[in-house]
């Protein structure tokens, strides 16, 4: 694969991943009410990083923002921070990579500068993807922990009125945003790796520019064998890699209703 193609594809994959990270961060369905083995309710709860929502079978949906910083769990704050850092790094990565793209000519910028910028954007995308993956994974771990804790509470006796009155505890499971986040983080990471690979192809090989003296009998001629490498030929530097391009499929929250509780 040519450097231009590798760099371009890396940029596009990173861009898709970055868009996915933004989508996941903004989505309300990070955690959704677990309906398995629960009495079927006419109310469905789901939560995001920024607000929690309730959808009634009537079709009425009410969302409330988390209007406090101090009252929120440290883990939620950490996940928010990781996702925002991922987005910020992604923005910088995109800006840098636009200037680094080989197909775009900006002034007298040489390949060496473009290579450095490509490497920089690649590293930024890798870190951005890692931030998203860690953020989503931390949230998922938090959900799993809370899920089993609430399950234990469920079966450790129902309180109130001598056990006559049952209180149903709302348990939460993985929401669509987690899967979007994982896929998006992965794509951003893959795109970043591709950019780094493209950088290696953009870097001029120093050995091609070294003058070598050959002493022929009776003559003292210094010459450079092979001359300069043509800018399109990369010889052994070319890596034949097959890039698997996945797509982050997202579903709109308000239209996503395929749950056993919901009939609207």
């Amino acid at each position: 694969m040519s450097v231009t193609a590798c760099q371009g594809l890396g940029f596009v994959v990173s861009l898709i991943g970055f868009a996915g990270i933004i989508a996941a961060t903004c989505m309300d369905q990070w955690s959704t009410q677990d309906l398995y083995n629960n009495p079927v309710t006419a109310v469905f709860n789901y939560q995001g990083l920024w607000r929690s929502c309730v959808r009634e079978s009537s079709g009425f949906t009410e969302c409330r923002g988390y209007f406090t910083l101090l009252g929120l769990p440290a883990m939620l704050q950490a996940v928010r921070a990781l996702m925002i850092v991922g987005i910020v790094l992604g923005v910088i990565g995109i800006l840098v990579s636009i200037f680094a793209l080989k197909c775009i000519r900006i002034g007298s910028m040489d390949d060496s500068a473009k290579a450095k910028m490509t490497l920089t954007s690649g590293i930024l995308f890798i870190i951005s993807g890692i931030c998203a993956i860690i953020g989503v994974s931390v949230f998922a771990n938090m959900l799993v922990t809370n899920f089993w804790m609430s399950t234990a509470n469920m079966y450790s006796g129902m309180g109130g009125m001598g056990g006559m009155v049952q209180t149903v505890q709302t348990r939460y499971t993985f929401g669509a945003a987690l899967f979007v986040g994982w896929v998006a983080g992965g794509l951003t990471l893959i795109g970043g790796v591709m950019m780094c690979i493209a950088c290696r192809g953009l870097t001029p090989d120093d050995s091609n520019f070294k003058a070598v003296s050959y002493h022929a009998s009776g003559q003292n001629v210094a010459y450079r064998p092979g001359g300069f490498k043509a800018s399109t030929g990369f010889g052994s530097n070319t890596r034949n890699k097959k890039i698997y391009d996945g797509g982050a499929r997202t579903e709109d929250d308000e239209q996503s209703h395929p749950t056993k509780y919901d009939y609207v």
Partner: antibody
Framework: QVQLQQSGAELIGPGTSVKVSCKAS????????IEWVKQRPEQGLEWIGL????????NYNEKFKGKATLTADKSSSTAYMQLSSLTSDDSAVYFC???????????WGQGTLVTVSA | DIVMTQSPSSLTVTAGEKVTMSCKSS????????????LTWYQQKPGQPPKLLIY???TRESGVPDRFTGSGSGTHFTLTISSVQAEDLAVYYC?????????FGSGTKLEKK
């Protein structure tokens, strides 16, 4: 304004079936659930089930599964409830209602009296 | 199914009197997501369909006089009529709107002395 107009009273024999209609007006029929409620003479209210007119999706009270079948016709903005294998226990007033905030029933039909008698 | 227990089954009142009726559910109707109780109160007069009075346990439907007040949370709910009028004589039902199947209480009948 929102209105639900139900079909007239029915007098039918045991073992037969009856189809009660509920014509909606004054709102987007497909956007709101229609619920059905049974009330026997001098008795309380029983929820039969609901239908989403937009998708045709239904949710029945287990007690009425096999007894009631809920359908809806979007073109005429009408919801239907068919009651089969009727017995004297099915003699009651049947109401249709439109869902509202809090899953409550804000708008009701006038009721259809079904009398099962030999 | 959720059992809704209403008490008393009937109340004899005079005009201007304050009336309180109770409704208890076998499971909590409080949704943790929005901290709302999915309990509804209806009024039914003879030969008429029920009329929505209060939803979310305490939210009065538009057009309902402010003498009607709903309160309570979880499993214990109350409907209060601050000053009963002649037109308030009817049967009052509470309903679970949280769990399927939706269930109604057996009703509290308000009669005049």
């Amino acid at each position: 304004q929102v209105q639900l107009q139900q079909s007239g009273a029915e007098l039918i024999g045991p073992g037969t079936s009856v189809k009660v209609s509920c014509k909606a007006s004054g709102y987007a029929f497909s956007n709101y659930l229609i619920e059905w409620v049974k009330q026997r003479p001098e008795q309380g209210l029983e929820w039969i089930g609901l239908i989403n007119p937009g998708s045709g999706g239904t949710n029945y009270n287990e007690k009425f599964k096999g007894k009631a079948t809920l359908t809806a016709d979007k073109s005429s903005s009408t919801a239907y409830m068919q009651l089969s294998s009727l017995t004297s226990d099915d003699s009651a007033v049947y109401f249709c209602a439109r869902v509202y905030y809090g899953n409550s029933f804000a708008y009701w039909g006038q009721g259809t009296l079904v009398t099962v008698s030999a | 199914d959720i059992v809704m227990t209403q008490s008393p089954s009937s109340l004899t009142v005079t005009a201007g009197e304050k009336v309180t009726m109770s409704c208890k559910s076998s499971q909590s109707l409080l949704n943790s997501g929005n901290q709302k109780n999915y309990l509804t109160w209806y009024q039914q007069k003879p030969g008429q369909p029920p009329k929505l009075l209060i939803y979310w346990a305490s939210t009065r439907e538009s057009g309902v006089p402010d003498r009607f007040t709903g309160s309570g949370s979880g499993t214990h709910f109350t409907l209060t009529i601050s000053s009963v009028q002649a037109e308030d004589l009817a049967v009052y039902y509470c309903q679970n709107d949280y769990f399927y199947p939706f269930t109604f209480g057996s009703g509290t009948k308000l009669e005049k002395k």
